[in-house]
């Protein structure tokens, strides 16, 4: 239950804490469990207890192990492990299961990458980060303080996030670099009544006689997967598979686009070789969903001969 | 006035069949988009399945490749082939039509009185 895992890279620092909490003015021993040996406390050796706390700076790989910390008040002695693992640096840029702190999820809304265990360094901004070994760059990620901040995030952002920052102890630099996974889950998706972006309510759409035309049907239900959301033309009050005309015809997959995360559906409507006739009827959008329908008219009109001026 | 009579409804055990019906009568049945749901006994009301023309279909996920839903314009009637049912396909199966005005909210979709689905053994 008093025991903790920690684990580090060698030639960087490593800070392990107590797992057993005190006072700030109980004193705390720190011992190597396989020789029973005290931890010094002066800070010239490269292994030192300070407090809470047991300062490998820098690791070896030698160091691993399992320490023993005793929290020592008037009353009570409370005893804690600490076990210590330092491994070699990777030559490749793969960081192995076993150096990963936990996995963080974000969505668009929160997207916060916390630094692991930085609170126990004296370190200075900024810190640097990377993905995948690249460090990152661009206006979309901002370290702030002991945090990564992703604006916009995508599906593409998820993989493994290190941090690295440079540990000050008493004017000598350590670098200490962490890495955990991110994973991006999808905000939960809710629907609403459809808009209709396109065409505007009684829009009048001008057309060439003996061209072709093409009118989309475009509108919105809301965020995330949609159960029912379907965009269809009608003409004259009559559904285009059933008005007959093999001029007249919808564009076959009603796919779901995501524009700024909003599911829309877009259905277009191909007129061949417009005809007079075509200029009397009726154009309806119509979306449809849980929360009901929505129809927008259009109406096609004879588009003017351009003038051509000398 | 818009009226909707479902039938076909029953008792049936198990992995059995059955066919729901609807007739529509009071409005231009071609121009609507039909649906069929459902309400069982303590829970909300549920779309099982919409057809929207004559190649677009809609499927609840519980339903998908059970349950078929169709419309025969000439008879102005929509089906409901339910094949494969289970204990908990158990529901008032209402029959709902949307058309017409430029805004309809789901509440004002026309509904049937509902015809009752019972699968037990």
């Known amino acids: 239950k008093f025991s903790k895992q920690s684990w580090g890279l060698e030639n960087e620092a490593l800070i392990v804490r107590c797992p057993r909490q005190g006072k700030p003015s109980y004193t705390v021993d720190w011992y190597y469990s396989q020789t029973n040996k005290s931890i010094p406390t002066q800070e010239r050796n490269r292994v030192f207890a300070s407090g809470q706390l047991l300062k490998f700076l820098p690791a070896a790989v030698a160091d691993s192990g399992i320490y023993t910390c005793i929290v020592r008040s008037p009353t009570f002695n409370r005893t804690g492990y600490a076990n210590v693992t330092i491994y070699k640096k990777q030559s490749d840029c793969n960081v192995p299961d076993y150096l990963m702190y936990s996995t963080v999820s974000g969505s668009e809304k929160n997207s916060k990458i916390y630094c692991p265990t930085i609170d126990l360094y004296n370190w200075t901004a900024p810190l640097e980060w990377f993905k995948n070994c690249q460090a990152l760059q661009g206006s979309r990620y901002r370290a702030h303080k002991s945090f990564l901040v992703i604006d916009n995030v995508m599906t593409e952002d998820a993989g493994d996030y290190t941090c690295k920052f440079i540990h000050n102890e008493n004017g000598a630099n350590y670098s200490v670099t962490a890495t955990r996974s991110f994973t991006v889950k999808d905000e939960q998706g809710f629907s609403l009544f459809p808009v209709i972006g396109a065409p505007a309510q009684n829009e009048i759409k001008e057309v060439e006689i003996g061209k072709n035309a093409n009118l989309t049907c475009s509108a919105c239900f809301g965020k995330g997967t949609q159960f029912l959301a379907a965009v269809l033309w009608q003409l004259n009050g009559t559904k285009i598979t059933d008005f007959g005309e093999p001029r007249i015809q919808q564009e076959e997959g009603q796919n779901q686009s995501f524009s700024n995360g909003l599911a829309c559906l877009d259905m277009v409507l191909r007129i061949a070789d417009v005809k007079e006739e075509d200029l009397l009827l009726q154009y309806d959008c119509l979306a449809l969903n849980l929360h009901g329908l929505r129809r927008h008219t259009v109406r096609l009109s004879r588009k003017n001969p351009i003038d051509h001026h000398s | 006035e818009v009226q909707l009579v479902e039938s076909g409804g029953g008792l049936v055990q198990p992995g059995g069949s059955l066919r729901l019906s609807c007739a529509a009568s009071?409005?231009?049945?071609?121009?609507?988009?039909m649906g069929w749901f459902r309400q069982a006994p303590g829970k909300e009301r549920e779309l099982v399945a919409v057809?929207?023309?004559?190649?677009?279909?809609k499927y609840a996920d519980s339903v998908k490749g059970r349950f078929t839903i169709s419309a025969d314009n000439s008879k102005n009637t929509a089906y409901l082939q339910m094949n494969s049912l289970k204990p908990e396909d158990t529901a008032v199966y209402y029959c709902?039509?949307?058309?017409?005005?430029?805004?309809?909210?789901?509440?004002?979709?026309?509904w049937g009185q509902g015809t009752l689905v019972t699968v037990s053994s």
């Open positions: 709902a039509a949307v058309g017409g005005a430029t805004t309809v909210t789901a509440s004002e979709w026309d």
């Open positions: 057809i929207i023309d004559s190649r677009t279909t």
């Open positions: 009071g409005f231009t049945f071609s121009s609507a988009i």
